[in-house]
Interface confidence: low
């Protein structure tokens, strides 16, 4: 015998109390698939977070960060603080990145400088808390066509600095 | 991110009407968007409701006699049968079960008179 | 349809006062509850949501409370700019109640 509840469409739920007909989901609620003897309760998206896309009967809600953060983890479970350019996020705020690293973003952790000397090449550019130094060519790459300057090192995944 | 309405004019009984609503600055896909009247000196008055999947949910006296839809970045109104009655601001809002009306637009006038 | 019964209609203070504002729903609304402040010939401006949550903006003088079929909008220290006029809303609709309004309290400031 088929399972009555597998008729019930996504926005429903198979009511058990009520001879298993299918009940529209209750206020702030939902249901994204058939047959779901339970409506799952829509995320709010309340204090740092702010509606990214309202819940409707059939899809849960996204909440994204409000101006002056920004989110952390699947589905943004986490709003964390930007800090400036030139500084990472610490247990005790937003603080400038030590000499010899820096950060171009808002998020994420200061890295070190690149060391032009290791690839045997010259400064071409200083860094600062902000941007990176930039290598120039080795004396031998002078040659036309070649590329002058090395591109900055990529940036890492964004996440929690070192606390 | 703002909402405008516009069409509102004035009309005799029984001639259909379209309101429109410009939303700028939000993806209609991501916010449910109501209508919402307010007749002159009157109070505030729910007409319906279009969700982001674009199921319609109406106030019981407008089914049949109004219609929500939508495009990428309008909401209309259609409105049929006009009576005196349904002389009113007509405002759009934006929310939904979450944060209720967050967003109006500044609202147009409908006069119904013969 | 769900109906909100809004009271008093009218109230006047003087500055420096405190109002409240109450609503009571026909049904549990389970806090689906959003209060609005509107002046003449303006749209309305959302101050409360979730019948107790100050909206971005709004200061700290409006506050609101309330649950199950109860609820109540109270305004402190008053302002000559807090006149206008207040409504509730019932704003979920799922569970096919509706969403309604209160009536409206209009809000006199002396």
């Known amino acids: 015998l088929q399972d009555p509840c597998s008729n019930c469409p996504a926005g429903t739920f198979c009511d058990n109390n009520r001879n298993q007909i299918c009940s529209p989901c209750p206020p702030n609620s939902f249901s994204s698939a058939g047959g779901q003897r339970t409506c799952d309760i829509c995320r709010q998206c309340k204090g740092v977070f702010r509606t990214r896309k309202e819940c409707s009967s059939t899809s849960n809600a996204e909440c994204d960060c409000t101006p002056g953060f920004h989110c952390l983890g699947a589905g943004c479970s986490m709003c964390e603080q930007d800090c400036k350019q030139g500084q990472e996020l610490t247990k005790k705020g937003c603080k400038d990145c030590c000499f010899g690293t820096f950060n171009d973003q808002k998020r994420g952790i200061c890295r070190p400088w690149t060391n032009c000397s290791l690839a045997g090449k010259p400064v071409l550019m200083n860094g600062t808390k902000a941007r990176d130094v930039v290598c120039g060519p080795r004396p031998a790459d002078l040659s036309p066509g070649a590329s002058s300057v090395t591109p900055p090192a990529p940036a890492r995944e964004p996440g929690h600095s070192p606390q | 991110q703002s909402l405008e309405e516009s069409g509102g004019r004035l009309v005799t009984p029984g001639t259909p009407l379209t309101l429109t609503c410009t939303v700028s600055?939000?993806?209609?896909?991501?916010?449910?968007m109501s209508w919402v009247r307010q007749a002159p000196g009157k109070g505030l008055e729910w007409i319906g409701y279009?969700?982001?999947?674009?199921s319609l949910y109406y106030a019981s006296w407008a089914k049949g006699r109004f219609t929500i839809s939508r495009t990428s970045t309008t909401v209309d109104l259609k409105m049929t049968s006009l009576t005196t009655e349904d002389t009113a601001t007509y405002f759009c809002?934006?929310?939904?079960?979450?944060?209720?009306?967050?967003?109006w637009g500044p609202g147009t006038l409908v006069t119904v008179s013969s | 349809d769900i109906v909100m019964t809004q009271t008093p209609a009218s109230v006047s203070e003087p500055v420096g006062g405190t109002v409240t504002i109450n609503c009571q729903a026909s049904?549990?609304?389970?806090?689906?509850l959003a209060w609005y402040q509107q002046k003449p010939g303006q749209r309305p401006k959302r101050l409360i949501y979730g019948a107790s949550d100050l909206a971005s903006g709004v200061p700290s003088r409006f506050s609101a409370s309330g649950s199950g079929t109860e609820y109540a909008l109270t305004i402190s220290d008053l302002e000559s700019a807090d006149a206008a006029t207040y409504y509730c809303h019932y704003y979920a609709t799922i569970s096919g109640l509706g969403v309604a309004f209160g009536g409206g309290t209009e809000v006199v400031v002396k």
């Open positions: 049904e549990d609304i389970s806090s689906y």
């Open positions: 600055g939000f993806s209609l896909n991501d916010y449910w």
């Open positions: 809002a934006r929310g939904g079960l979450t944060y209720g009306f967050d967003l």
């Open positions: 279009i969700d982001v999947g674009g």
